[in-house]
């Protein structure tokens, strides 16, 4: 039993972690600067998307890049519980706090703000430079989707790294996982064409959910054949003239559930991965 | 002046490097096993490409993946001159060999075989599982292209890492370079749509040359509108019914030079990067 409550411990751990973050601002400022620069570079490359076949390719390309970038940059989250492992074991054994207080304290003060910022920065810069769908809901859905991808990827990083003493193995394992997840995200291969004995792997792919949601959000209601003047029975059947046609060919469900089910899946992954990370910390103290 | 000739020294360095390679086979065997497994996985995912719109997406996707994989896996080449830096300085100062003998010896015995193998393995596995263009010249052009990409990426790694004491900085720099090169390769963004003040960056992208060559090699002469006798002059500018239409939309020159100029560019990059690496080794001994 502890003399202080869970909330008090949580506040204390959060405060200390946040102070560490502010006391050593180089890392966080560097991350923000890199994100801003990358956002501006992406914005410049894809500036002013067209509504033609190149517009389809460029939209898919930038959404894929943003999704996979969120994943790969989340690899750094492996450090969260690794670098302080000895300190955590010492303080836990000394009865300073519960595992749960430490766990949620670190998440609230470190993971939550540091994974939220890039999503906000990317969306704010990229959205208007590219001229993505000009509706407020589409803007915030994109921001929310990128956050969910970042959180699920970071949660996976924590689940793999929690309790480990060295970062390198976890980083390597994460990178390999993300490479395979990237293949199954839906840009490099049309997911409807994969053999059934392999296609189930797509359901374990974080970027697949993020990329699908971003595409659903951006492509629905778009038209990619401006001023089309073609005869009825000709090769134009093979063109992709509407966002819906593109999404259909990608095997994406066009209903509202076709969008939100991706966020539900990411939320489930976050819960599962964080539970694993928490249990690993819980078992860690038993073997200390 | 040296008592032994350049050729003798070259043979001696090559022999020793090759012995080290065979004496510690885990790394090379592991690389071969990983390549074979990855080849089979890619082969299974993309098995039997269709000749429809999904066939365009999947062909482009797999060629992009193979190209970028060759680049990113070449990052490991940074180790070639870094791990033996102290030994090289000691042996060079002791008058064992010329810088040129050491440089070319390491390239011949280490870089050449270890970068050639993945290209051969990938092509042999992937080509037939996917059912790519069924001609011998197309098969060998693909193999040659993947080799050229691997060599130019490895040369870039050497140019960055030569003379450095730690691998990590060079690896990070390489990775950042390849991420930007990957954006400019031609899948994530249609290169014809990039603003002129930025589009020149594509000419510094290794994967762009590899990906363009692979696409030229694979798409030329293909038909993607089954049940339609598609001509090059399509009646619908929004449909992509032939490989030529696809390549044209990507801004790829359809002439034979449109293929080979990519290999020439990669060859030039190899020469430039290896020259930089050699000069860095040459200047290294001056400051030893």
């Amino acid at each position: 039993s502890y003399t202080t409550s869970f909330c008090h411990q949580l506040r204390w751990v959060s405060k200390r972690s946040f102070k560490n973050l502010l006391g050593n601002p180089q890392a966080s400022i560097a991350q923000i600067i890199v994100t801003v620069i990358l956002g501006l570079v992406i914005g410049a490359i894809y500036f002013g998307l067209n509504n033609d076949s190149t517009g389809i390719q460029n939209r898919a390309g930038v959404l894929f890049f943003l999704t996979t970038n969120q994943c790969f940059s989340s690899v750094s989250a492996v450090e969260l519980f690794v670098v302080e492992k000895k300190l955590f074991i010492h303080e836990y054994i000394s009865g300073y706090y519960r595992v749960s207080s430490y766990f949620f304290g670190k998440l609230l003060s470190d993971l939550l703000p540091m994974r939220m910022l890039p999503s906000i920065i990317f969306t704010c810069i990229v959205y208007f430079m590219l001229g993505l769908k000009p509706t407020a809901d589409a803007f915030f859905i994109m921001m929310f989707t990128l956050m969910m991808v970042a959180y699920s990827a970071s949660s996976m990083a924590l689940a793999i790294a929690a309790g480990q003493s060295v970062v390198s193995v976890a980083t390597l394992l994460m990178t390999i996982c993300f490479v395979f997840m990237m293949i199954f995200s839906g840009l490099l291969v049309n997911l409807t064409t994969i053999a059934s004995w392999l296609s189930w792997l797509q359901y374990f792919s974080i970027p697949r959910y993020g990329f699908t949601a971003l595409q659903h959000n951006e492509f629905l209601g778009q038209n990619f054949c401006p001023g089309l003047n073609a005869t009825v029975n000709n090769t134009c059947n093979y063109a992709t003239c509407t966002g819906e046609e593109y999404l259909t060919k990608q095997g994406i469900d066009l209903s509202p559930w076709g969008l939100w089910k991706n966020h539900v899946a990411l939320a489930c992954m976050i819960v599962i991965f964080l539970t694993i990370a928490y249990l690993k910390l819980l078992f860690l103290k038993k073997y200390s | 002046s040296y008592t032994t000739s350049f050729c003798h020294q070259l043979r001696w360095v090559s022999k020793r490097s090759f012995k080290n390679l065979l004496g510690n086979p885990q790394a090379s065997i592991a690389q071969i096993i990983v390549t074979v497994i990855l080849g089979l996985v890619i082969g299974a995912i993309y098995f039997g490409l269709n000749n429809d719109s999904t066939g365009i997406q999947n062909r482009a996707g797999v060629l992009f993946f193979l190209t970028t994989n060759q680049c990113f896996s070449s990052v490991s080449a940074v180790e070639l001159f870094v791990v033996e830096k102290k030994l090289f300085i000691h042996e060079y100062i002791s008058g064992y060999y010329r810088v040129s003998s050491y440089f070319f010896g390491k390239l011949l015995s280490d870089l050449l075989p270890m970068r050639m193998l993945p290209s051969i393995i990938f092509t042999c596995i992937v080509y037939f599982m996917l059912g790519l263009k069924p001609t011998a010249d197309a098969f060998f052009i693909m193999m040659f292209t993947l080799m050229m990409v691997a060599y130019s990426a490895s040369s870039m790694a050497l140019a960055i890492a030569a003379g450095q004491s730690v691998v990590s900085v060079a690896t990070l720099l390489m990775t950042i370079c390849f991420v930007f090169m990957m954006i400019f390769s031609g899948l994530l963004v249609n290169l014809t749509t990039i603003a002129s003040w930025l589009s020149w960056l594509q000419y510094f992208s290794i994967p762009r040359y590899g990906f363009t060559a692979l696409q030229h090699n694979e798409f030329l002469g293909q038909n993607f509108c089954p049940g339609l006798n598609a001509t090059v002059n399509n009646t619908c500018n929004y449909a992509t019914c032939t490989g030529e239409e696809y390549l044209t939309k990507q801004g790829i020159d359809l002439s034979p030079w449109g293929l080979w100029k990519n290999h020439v560019a990669l060859a030039c990059m190899i020469v430039i990067f290896l020259t930089i690496a050699y000069l860095k080794l040459l200047f290294l001994k001056k400051y030893s």
Partner: antibody, heavy 118, light 106 residues
Framework: EIQLVQSGAEVKKPGASVKVSCKAS????????INWVRQAPGQRLEWIGW????????KYNEKFKGRATLTVDTSASTGYMELSSLRSEDTAVYFC???????????WGQGTLVTVSS | EKVLTQSPATLSLSPGERATLSCRAS?????MYWHQQKPGQSPRLWIY???NLAPGVPARFSGSGSGNDYTLTISSLEPEDFAVYYC?????????FGGGTKLEIK
């Protein structure tokens, strides 16, 4: 010649199900969308849903979601529309129509009259 | 859901006269499509992409419009033109039809 041939007229009791078929010929079945539309006596055309035979992606009108089921048999180049829990207001002529992408209906079937009566 | 309102519901004209059929969308659409339906028959594509005539459609027919308002015009009515005309649009994965305009002989 492009043709969409539908199955014959049906008489069903309320609460029952009906399955209408649409046999396509004269074109590559998997390259075009199959849409289903109904027309009640003296009423406007009402879209039920579409199916893309290329990868069996389906979209339904919210009004028919849960009651209508669209399927295809690509080997037989045939589309099917099943409507369950039939009510008297489902009495209508049911049409299948081929669409070029999701752009326009360029060919229609001859229609199938479904009568729901107790 | 977008609603298409056709006006007038019935249009009574004589052969040789000019006919103007209107279709208004509740919000902006990319293109409008028109179908002709005669009694006891299935509909036929008549105009696509707002202004393109389907194969076999006489040149006296024309289509125009943009945004919310679209029009089908018949410059000089022929006896075979008397039928019901439906406008149709596609937005965010769903199709909707207008209520139809019945073109009848006066």
């Amino acid at each position: 010649e492009i043709q969409l041939v539908q199955s014959g007229a049906e008489v069903k009791k309320p609460g029952a199900s009906v399955k209408v078929s649409c046999k396509a010929s004269g074109y590559t079945f998997t390259d075009y969308y199959i849409n289903w539309v109904r027309q009640a006596p003296g009423q406007r055309l009402e879209w039920i849903g579409w199916i893309y035979p290329g990868n069996v992606n389906v979209k339904y009108n919210e009004k028919f979601k849960g009651r209508a089921t669209l399927t295809v048999d690509t080997s037989a180049s045939t589309g099917y529309m099943e409507l369950s829990s039939l009510r008297s207001e489902d009495t209508a002529v049911y049409f299948c129509a081929r669409s070029i992408g999701l752009r326009y209906f360029d060919n229609w079937g001859q229609g199938t009259l479904v009568t729901v009566s107790s | 859901e977008k609603v298409l309102t056709q006006s007038p519901a019935t249009l009574s004209l004589s052969p040789g006269e000019r006919a103007t059929l209107s279709c208004r969308a509740s919000s902006s659409v990319h293109y409008m499509y028109w179908h002709q339906q005669k009694p006891g028959q299935s509909p036929r594509l008549w105009i696509y992409y707002t202004s393109n005539l389907a194969p076999g459609v006489p040149a006296r027919f024309s289509g125009s419009g943009s945004g919310n308002d679209y029009t089908l015009t018949i410059s000089s009515l022929e006896p075979e033109d008397f039928a019901v005309y439906y406008c149709q649009q596609f937005t965010t994965s769903t199709w909707t039809f207008g209520g139809g305009t019945k073109l009848e002989i006066k």
